[in-house]
């Protein structure tokens, strides 16, 4: 079990890389001028409490930033939110955080990351481009839910 | 408001089991851990086990486990606590509670009224 | 496994300050065990008070605190109230497993 965030590159199948603007997180494409935000990735240490087969549950956090992706209900709708977090606070916490923790599941060189509070719920981006990251329960329609990550450092 | 109500009082005979239960209100049992504490008279309280109820999942203290069973049925909001080979040294208040995260951190919050186990042959 | 320890009764005088404590046997108590604090009034249900060391409950009042001292988890009640006379449990966290002291009495006389 790793005991360090890994840092790593994230973009979508677009070659869109995730960018802080506003303390939102948004999609656009890779241009010279674009600052991508590089993720800190830690997988939950308490993996034999959550469920298998879903994929490595894991705390995905802005390197350098203590900002930390999390999922709550807005309305009776689950959204994605940036908080003010140290992803090794949540990483050593008695219990899973599930509202901050992700199921990362991986077929060739695809990501998804699926929402361990609200199953069946993943981050994705709308297919234009310079949109917030959202959830969506709809894979492959109008949303990308599947992400490429490259391991940095 | 959040409430913990559990079921009533017990008196079982040495070798027999019980199961007893803790209804959940006022919030989704799914977004939290409840957890099962004990205090047999004159003591202080001693952890037994947990539950996540989304999940189903359990841990033990290592001194319970295997005695311990923690289940929960969140169409009823229930979680209940089987104790099984009972003893006499296992007549104690039998607790639920609920650990919840708020903040920055996990609070064991709120607190069923306990339930009196009485093992007596 | 662990024992943890608390004062078995203490007493403050209304007004005054008293800090009760919580040791382990395994060594100091550190921000890992995410010391617990519950309180138990006579004829009312457990309360949680504090969290993660040092961090209080919703609702909690500003006169309770938790901190470490001298290699113990501690509850701190600064202007203590008639109404604050109860049990006072505390519980820390051994990497899977809870652990619950004894509980300490405190009377406000």
């Known amino acids: 079990k790793s005991e360090m965030p890994q840092p790593v590159s994230i973009q979508d199948i677009n070659h869109r890389v995730w960018v802080l603007q506003d303390q939102i997180l948004i999609a656009v494409p890779r241009k010279d001028r674009v600052s991508p935000v590089t993720i800190s990735l830690i997988s939950c240490r308490h993996v034999e409490t959550l469920e298998k087969d879903r994929g490595n549950p894991i705390y995905l956090g802005l390197n350098g930033l203590n900002l930390c992706l999390m999922c709550a209900k807005a309305g009776d709708q689950p959204t994605l939110q940036l908080k003010e977090k140290d992803i090794m606070d949540l990483y050593n916490q008695p219990e899973p955080v599930k509202s901050f923790l992700f199921y990362h599941s991986q077929s060739g060189r695809n990501s998804t990351f699926e929402s361990v509070a609200f199953p069946g719920w993943f981050i994705a981006v709308s297919s234009e481009g310079g949109c917030p990251l959202i959830l969506t329960q709809e894979l492959g329609k109008a949303n990308t839910t599947d992400f490429g990550l490259t391991m940095l450092f | 408001q959040v409430q913990l109500v559990q079921s009533g009082a017990e008196v079982k005979k040495p070798g027999a089991s019980v199961k007893v239960s803790c209804k959940a209100s006022?919030?989704?049992?799914?977004?939290?851990?409840i957890h099962w504490v004990r205090q047999a008279p004159g003591q202080g309280l001693e952890w037994i086990g947990r539950?996540?109820?989304?999940?189903?999942?359990?841990r033990y203290d290592p001194k319970f486990q295997g005695r311990a069973t923690i289940t929960t049925d969140t169409s009823t909001s229930t979680v209940y606590l089987e104790f099984s080979s009972l003893r006499s040294e296992d007549t104690a208040v039998y607790y639920c509670?609920?650990?919840?995260?708020?903040?920055?951190?996990?609070?064991?919050?709120?607190w069923g009224q306990g339930t009196l186990v009485t093992v007596s042959s | 496994q662990a024992v943890v320890t608390q004062e078995p009764s203490l007493t403050v005088s209304p007004g005054g300050t008293v800090t009760l404590t919580c040791r382990s046997s395994?060594?100091?108590?550190?921000?890992?065990?995410?010391a617990n604090w519950v309180q138990e009034k006579p004829g009312q249900l457990f309360a949680g008070l504090i969290g993660?060391?040092?961090d209080r409950a919703p609702g909690v009042p500003a006169r309770f605190s938790g901190s470490l001292l001298g290699g113990k988890a501690a509850l701190t009640l600064s202007g203590a109230q008639p109404e604050d006379e109860a049990d006072y449990f505390c519980?820390?966290?051994?990497?899977?497993?809870?652990?619950f002291g004894g509980g300490t009495k405190l009377t406000v006389l």
């Open positions: 509670a609920r650990l919840h995260y708020f903040g920055n951190n996990f609070f064991f919050d709120y």
């Open positions: 006022g919030f989704n049992i799914k977004d939290t851990y």
């Open positions: 539950i996540d109820p989304a999940i189903g999942t359990t």
């Open positions: 993660g060391t040092n």
């Open positions: 519980a820390l966290w051994f990497s899977n497993h809870w652990v």
């Open positions: 395994s060594g100091a108590v550190t921000t890992s065990n995410y």
